[in-house]
């Protein structure tokens, strides 16, 4: 006997109670492939989740996170809170970046300021919790008549202006 279920398209299920007739998925359920014997329950995007794509008979709903949160995990299974620029999310909540580090995004970790002296440059603009330092040419490069043979002057370490 040929399995009639294989003929059932996505959006339907093979109803064994009705001689393997293809029945449409009930409301709030879907089947994304043909030949299914059951339809899967649609994902509900509620609470901290919001709907990005409605459920249809052939595809599951897709969720996003509400404002103030961002997605984590496969198919946005989790919503992690945003922090302000100049902070990082620790296990106990948002925490200001330590001196010498910065974060210019609402997520991620605080990263160390660039060390200008490693490139033989000086600090043009001091770093803050929200912004990296801006490196400029070394003082030797700025002096009149400086040649490439002139050894670079010692660069200042990144500074931090009071907030």
């Amino acid at each position: 006997l040929q399995d009639l279920c294989s003929n059932c398209p996505a959006g339907t299920f093979c109803d064994n109670n009705r001689s393997q007739i293809c029945s449409p998925c009930p409301p709030n359920s879907f089947s994304s492939a043909g030949g299914q014997r059951t339809c899967d329950i649609c994902r509900q995007c509620k609470g901290v989740f919001k709907t990005r794509k409605e459920c249809s008979s052939t595809s599951n709903a897709e969720c996003d996170c509400i404002s103030g949160y961002h997605c984590l995990g496969a198919e946005c299974s989790m919503c992690e809170q945003d922090c302000k620029q100049g902070q990082e999310l620790t296990k106990k909540g948002c925490k200001d970046c330590c001196f010498g580090t910065f974060n210019d995004q609402k997520r991620g970790i605080c990263r160390p300021w660039t060390n200008c002296s490693l490139d033989g440059k000086s600090v043009l603009v001091n770093g803050t919790k929200e912004r990296d330092v801006v490196c400029g040419p070394s003082p030797a490069d700025l002096s009149p008549g400086a040649s490439s043979a002139t050894p670079p002057a010692p660069a200042r370490e990144p500074g931090h202006s009071p907030q």
Epitope: E80, E88, L89, T90, K91, K92, K95, I109
Partner: nanobody, 124 residues
């Protein structure tokens, strides 16, 4: 392939207990700190507890301290969360997580692998 598979969730009455397990595979379990996080229905992901690689140091969120106990069996590549005196506000999807760092209580989320989650519902 690195995988974390949680189990042990379910429906429990307030005051009841549950024990969650997380079976790890695809990496040297005993080398990494591990954590539990939870996603309540109405709010964002929250850290619950962490344990260092050896199991010697454990850390807890204030909301679960004294009620939950994290442990691990490195010979079985398994992480556990014993949850006692459960409350309605403990209702959430619980996720097991592999830490990339030392797993202290105030470190940033240095999580590089998440499990698929297990649902805990506390209701009468």
């Amino acid at each position: 392939e690195v995988q974390l598979l949680e189990s042990g969730g379910g429906l429990v009455q307030p005051g009841g207990s549950l024990r969650l397990s997380c079976a790890a595979s695809g990496f040297t379990f005993s080398n990494y700190a591990m954590s539990w996080f939870r996603q309540p229905p109405e709010t964002g992901l929250k850290w619950v507890s962490s344990i260092d690689a050896s199991g010697g140091d454990t850390y807890y969120a204030d909301s679960v301290k004294g009620r939950f106990t994290i442990s691990r069996d490195n010979s079985k590549n398994t992480l556990y969360l014993q949850m006692n005196s459960l409350r309605a506000e403990d209702t959430a999807v619980y996720y097991c997580a592999k830490e990339g760092s030392h797993g202290t209580d105030d470190s940033h989320y240095d999580v590089d692998v998440w499990g698929q989650g297990t649902t805990v519902t506390v209701s009468s």
